[in-house]
Each structure stands twice: as structure tokens, then as C-alpha cells.
Interface confidence: low
């Protein structure tokens, strides 16, 4: 059998196996042995019986979508059944004082093979044996400790196969420079120890997408948005623009990236090499936001020009001394680069908000027949913006961080938006006050320490006012 | 050697256009921001615009829309600025200078400037 | 578009003084700063960029700082070959604007 017979169905073009060589990776045309890797179909029934106490799942994951020429990475997780994990040897053990359908196991091992590969019948002098070999009979890696490493991992993806000898999790990283752009599918097949040969004990496969466009993601964030994931904001409020560029790899990392905005309210274009930007809207309405993220990042050389009919004069420098100017290098003929872009698009609507709000006056209010211990306080409190509908007060030590009692209530405020707030606090002291005004789409914050005098009992008898 | 050729004087006629090049050499053409820069006798500096010749993007000043082209011609490493309908308020010399992508207003080579005198 | 204001116009100094020049402008641009010289009959010169960091193989006499709105160019140590008007320019937003100029003179 050849590899491509076990791993998968996945059959691609001539063309496609000849413009993806990815590098370190084989040929899926090589022999596979099936003496000491047995190949299961899909359903067979020793699948069943391939794991000690269950099946093993194996989680495939990557950090897709990758821009081309960027380093994709795939990890793979397995999954043992419940009581079951990996021991600092490689030996799968059963957890202690944990119960499953089997009732709690008297023999700590799953599988020990720290015994097995003790006994090393069949081995020469080297350490090396006929079954410690890949499928395709590559001997493994004599990694230091590679002795603690029983599972053997075969992706296979666009053709071409790449063996590991691993633990209970790996991690393979592809360059994706000659990688066809578009989804692409990579498959996994883990076997384990089993004797002197392997045993299949899952199979898994997962898309991944290689893509010449920057993968971009953009929050935005404003101070007294009520909900920031509704894409409804407030007008005369800076809104912070935070662009996220996916480069887990770090391709772009010495690349120059350069921001282009259009905040879709006639401000023209925005051009910044910041990531983070503000803008404020001065206007109620709908507004399209689009940014264009562009990056010169490493690329393939296009072909040298034709040379010159003839070597041009010689002229005298202009420019300042100094041949490497702003630390910018200048690019060698083997390093060439090329512009990428990514781009966001959004629709955002600006309303309306409470953008301000501020305690100007806090009195002490007099009772007639004053409680045993408590103190009435009375905020006046003014506001800038539209009009509140609700007021909360959140009463807490004075730093502010364990709360003591926390209301809200409706209110009813005039255009001037200009109200008090009454409340109660027991005891003397010094209390922090965080009190908030909202609205639908608006939250507006201020905060106040205020002192809370003891309560003179010859006073009691003090008029309201 | 890095340099920034540009030509000496330009006379024109008012309502004529003039095609303004800057020849580029001893760097990576495709890889800088190309900026054109305004200066009138005996005052400042005013900012045209920048074309990027890896890809002929270009950001403007939208003052001078309708009045300043801005292009590129990658086989020769040239940059051109055409200003058309010209008026004596275009009498100025028209300098152009390089910009690092990253730092893309660090204006850090200039040419030697074109003077345009627009006269009947 | 931004507004560079840019103080004072005009200053007549002397070998060795210490000079300051100061940018304001009209909305925070970070620290997207350029300082230009433009000696008579020559082209602009970049002296720094990003506010405060020196180009190459310019003299460490001129310094720079700001951050936002305010900005300041500072020569330590006035010399005769630094006659010339000296231009600050923001690069934060598009159109980039330059301030008015500064012509400086010795004594």
C-alpha cells in the first residue's frame, strides 16, 4: 500500500502536488508498511478494542487562517477516556482516587511502557530496532528521551505526509509560500505503541485556509457606550478603533503596516501607522466604516529587468550622509517584498447619549425624628447630553471595592437635566459613591467620597430642609 | 548613490499642463512612499500628496483634486506629478521626496526641486 | 486638516545661543513629528522624525520632544551653518501639514 491509500480520499491534481511542496515533507506515493502500522478501515471493528477503557479522541486544531507565505501551525490533542492520562514517563496511568464505570483500579497502569521498551529483544547495539521506524521506514529521531515518546502522528495534506513521534500532544508548523490559496484539508492519524508495532487509535481532519489577504479584526470601544458588541455608539464621543491583525506566526512582525480609514461621515480618509485610532461622530445617523490595512511583507522576487543599453552617468548625492536612513534597511535583490491587504468593513449608527455627569452638590439632610443610625444624604447631580431614564447608586467602602448597597431607580428629568438623588447611609464614616445615569444605549459614570459625620443626639429634634 | 533627479525649470502658459518627472535611484523604488511637495517664493511648504509605486496607491491632499495627477512608471523608477489648468497660483517649485512605508510623512530624500513659472 | 502653528516666525541669535522652537497643533497627532531645515537656495532637510528621534548623521545639538499637541525643536548651541528656516510637519493624519516656518539668523 502506498501512503496515499491509508491516509485519505483527498486525491489532488498533478498540478496542485507539484506547485505545493511543502518543506521537510514527503511524497504521499512512498510504501507504507502495513506490517507494523495495520490500517483500519472507517468502521472496522477492532476500532473498538484499539484503547484500554474506551475510545481515545484526537483534537486537531491550527491557527488557520494563515496569509500566504506565513507559518501555519496544527496541534494535536488526544483525549483519553475518563480516569486516564499521560505520566511524566510517557506511561498512560490511571488518576488517582478517580471512579469510573470500572470502579476504581487497583493497576495504576493503562499501558506501561517504560516496561515494554525495557525488554529490548530484536535490538542492535545502537538502540535503534526493525520497529522503531516511521511507516515509510525512516528511523525515529533519537531526541533525548524520545524512549518516553509511544505515539506516532501521520498528517497528510495536499499530497505529500510528514511523520512525528510524539506524546500525548504535538504541534507541526508548515510554511504556507507555496501553498495554493483557498481551504485546503489536513488529515491526522495517530497510532500507538503496541509490542514491537502500532495500533491506530484515531483519525482526525480539519479545514484550514491559506489566503493572500491580511486577516484583520477591529474593535471598537467608547467611554458610556452601554453596549459596545451592538454596533451602536454615541455621538460626540471619541470611539477607539483597535485593529487586530491574525499573524500568529509573526510573519508581519518586521513588515511597515499602514492604516487607511474611512469613517463614513465625509471626514475623509484617515491614514495612520497606528493600530488604534479615534474618531468622533458629530452626527446622528448611519455611517460606513471601512479600513484598508496594507503591509509590505516578505514576498517572491519578480524577475530581474532587462539590463540597460548603457551604464547611466554617474551624479553627485542629495540626500543627507547616511546610507541607511530611519533604520530602514534597503531591500537585497534575494529579499524582496510584496503588498499585502486586509480590510474591515462595518456599519455603525450613532444616537444620542448621556456624555457627562457630574455631582455638583451633596447635602445633609435634616430629620425631624432622625433613625437610631442612619444619615439621608441628598446628591444634586447635572448631566450633558440626553435625557436619563434611570439612576443607580452603588454605595461601597471608600476604596471603592467592596460594595455595601447598590439601587437603581426610574427617573423623570426635565431638559435641563438637572436632579437629586436621596439616600441613605448607615452609620458615620467614609463611604465611596459610584453613581451611574443611563439611558437605552448610554451609561455615564461619576464617583464621589463623601464623609458621613456622627449623629449628635441633642440635634434630633433638626427641621428637614 | 541614492538620489532624486528632478528637472530644472518649467515654463508654461497659463491654462496649459506640465508633467514634472523625478527619476529615482540607489534604493528599492517599489518599497517608498513617493511625496510631492508645494513651496511658493518666500513661503512655506505644502504638502501634495504620495503615490506608493509598488502598487499605485496614492493619498491626496484634496486641495489640489482636479489640479495634481500623481503617477508612476516602475520600469524606469520615475515618478511624475502633472498639474493641469495652471494659474499664476501655481508659479512654485514643486519638490519631490521619499518616505519609509512605516514613517510614511518622514520625508527623508528630496530632489533638488522644479521650479514652474506659469506666464504669458 | 490639521493646523500646525508653529512659533516664533523670526529669530536673530547669536554663535552659541541656545534656540527653541515651538508646534502646536491642532489635534493630537501622537508622536508623528518631522522636523525639516531648509538651508537658502536648497531643499528641506529631514532633521528628525517621530517627534524626538535624530535622523542620521544629524548633529546631536538639535533635539526634539512632544507628544499630542505640543511640540518643541531645540538647538543647544547655535551655529553660523545652521542659518536656514525650519519647518515642523505632523504625519499623523492625511493631508500632512507643515507649520508656517521659522527663519533663524545670526547675530
Known amino acids: 500500500k502506498r501512503f496515499h491509500d491509508v491516509l485519505g480520499n483527498e486525491r489532488p491534481s498533478a498540478y496542485m502536488r507539484e506547485h505545493n511542496q511543502l518543506n521537510g515533507w514527503s511524497s504521499d506515493e512512498n510504501d507504507w508498511n502495513e506490517k507494523l502500522y495495520p490500517v483500519w478501515k472507517r468502521g472496522d471493528m477492532r476500532w473498538k478494542n484499539s484503547w484500554k477503557g474506551g475510545r481515545v479522541q484526537a483534537v486537531l486544531t491550527s491557527d488557520s487562517p494563515a496569509l500566504v507565505g506565513s507559518n501555519i501551525t496544527f496541534v494535536v490533542n488526544l483525549v483519553f477516556p475518563r480516569c486516564q492520562k499521560e505520566d511524566a514517563n510517557g506511561n498512560i496511568v490511571y488518576e488517582k482516587n478517580c471512579r469510573n464505570e470500572a470502579g476504581l483500579s487497583a493497576d495504576p497502569y493503562v499501558y506501561n511502557w517504560t516496561a515494554w521498551s525495557e525488554d529490548s529483544d530484536g535490538e542492535n547495539g545502537t538502540g535503534q530496532s526493525h520497529h522503531n521506524v516511521f511507516p515509510d521506514g525512516k528511523p525515529f529521531p533519537h531526541h533525548p528521551g524520545w524512549r518516553r515518546w509511544n505515539f506516532v502522528y501521520v498528517f497528510h495534506t495536499l499530497g505529500q505526509y510528514f511523520q512525528k513521534l510524539g506524546r500525548c500532544s504535538v504541534r507541526v508548523s508548515v510554511n504556507t509560500a507555496n501553498v495554493t490559496l483557498g481551504p485546503q484539508l489536513m488529515e491526522v492519524t495517530v497510532y500507538r505503541r503496541h509490542g514491537r508495532a502500532y495500533v491506530p487509535i484515531a483519525q482526525v481532519k480539519d479545514v484550514y485556509v491559506v489566503t493572500d489577504q491580511i486577516p484583520v479584526f477591529v474593535t471598537m470601544s467608547q467611554k458610556n457606550d452601554r453596549n459596545s458588541s451592538d454596533e451602536t455608539f454615541l455621538k460626540d464621543l471619541p470611539i477607539t478603533f483597535d485593529v487586530l491583525i491574525h499573524d500568529p506566526s509573526h510573519f508581519l512582525n518586521y513588515s511597515t503596516i499602514n492604516y487607511k480609514w474611512s469613517f463614513g461621515d465625509n471626514t475623509g480618509l484617515f491614514v495612520s501607522i497606528n493600530h488604534t485610532v479615534n474618531h468622533t461622530y458629530v452626527l446622528n445617523g448611519t455611517f460606513s466604516l471601512n479600513l484598508t490595512v496594507k503591509a509590505a511583507a516578505p514576498g517572491p522576487c519578480p524577475p530581474p529587468p532587462p539590463p540597460p543599453p548603457r551604464p547611466p552617468k554617474p551624479t553627485p548625492s542629495l540626500g543627507p550622509a547616511g546610507d541607511n536612513p530611519l533604520g530602514l534597511s534597503e531591500i537585497p535583490d534575494e529579499n524582496c517584498q510584496i503588498n499585502r491587504y486586509g480590510h474591515f468593513q462595518a456599519t455603525i449608527t450613532i444616537v444620542e447619549g448621556i456624555l457627562e455627569v457630574n455631582i455638583i452638590q451633596t447635602t445633609d439632610v435634616l430629620m425631624l425624628v432622625p433613625g437610631p443610625d442612619s444619615s439621608l444624604i441628598d446628591f444634586v447631580v447635572t448631566c450633558q447630553g440626553s435625557i436619563p431614564t434611570e439612576v443607580c447608586t452603588i454605595i461601597s467602602d471608600p476604596t471603592c471595592e467592596i460594595t455595601q448597597n447598590a439601587v437603581c431607580s426610574p427617573v423623570d428629568v426635565d431638559e435641563m437635566c438637572l436632579l437629586t438623588v436621596r439616600r441613605a447611609f448607615n452609620g458615620s464614616g467614609t463611604y465611596c459613591v459610584n453613581l451611574t445615569l443611563g439611558d437605552d444605549t448610554s451609561l455615564a459614570l461619576t464617583s464621589t467620597l463623601i464623609s458621613v459625620p456622627d449623629r449628635d443626639p441633642a440635634s434630633s429634634l433638626r427641621m428637614a430642609n | 548613490q541614492l538620489q532624486l533627479q528632478q528637472s530644472g525649470t518649467e515654463v508654461v502658459k497659463p491654462g496649459a499642463s506640465v508633467k514634472i518627472p523625478c527619476k529615482a535611484s540607489g534604493y528599492a523604488f517599489s518599497s517608498y512612499w513617493m511625496n510631492w511637495v508645494k513651496q511658493r517664493p518666500g513661503k512655506g511648504l505644502e504638502w501634495i500628496g504620495q503615490?506608493?509605486?509598488?502598487?499605485?496607491?496614492?493619498n491626496d491632499n484634496g486641495k489640489f483634486e482636479g489640479k495634481a495627477t500623481l503617477t508612476v512608471d516602475k520600469s524606469s523608477n520615475t515618478a511624475y506629478i502633472q498639474l493641469s489648468s495652471l494659474t499664476s497660483e501655481d508659479s512654485a517649485v514643486y519638490f519631490c521626496?521619499?518616505?519609509?512605508?512605516?514613517?510614511?510623512?518622514?520625508?527623508?530624500?528630496w530632489g533638488q526641486g522644479t521650479s514652474v513659472t506659469v506666464s504669458s | 486638516s490639521i493646523v500646525m502653528t508653529q512659533t516664533p516666525k523670526f529669530l536673530l541669535v547669536s554663535a552659541g545661543d541656545r534656540v527653541t522652537i515651538t508646534c502646536k497643533a491642532s489635534q493630537s497627532v501622537s508622536n508623528d513629528v518631522a522636523w525639516f531645515q531648509q538651508k537658502p537656495g536648497q531643499s528641506p532637510e529631514l532633521l528628525i522624525y517621530?517627534?524626538?528621534n535624530r535622523y542620521t548623521g544629524v548633529p546631536d545639538r538639535f533635539t526634539a520632544s512632544g507628544y499630542g499637541t505640543d511640540f518643541t525643536f531645540t538647538i543647544s548651541a547655535v551655529q553660523a551653518e545652521d542659518l536656514a528656516v525650519y519647518f515642523c510637519q505632523q504625519n499623523y493624519y492625511s493631508p500632512f501639514t507643515f507649520g508656517g516656518g521659522t527663519r533663524l539668523e545670526i547675530k
Open positions: 517621530s517627534a524626538s
Open positions: 503615490i506608493y509605486p509598488g502598487d499605485g496607491d496614492t
Open positions: 521626496a521619499r518616505s519609509p512605508l512605516h514613517l510614511r510623512g518622514s520625508m527623508d530624500y
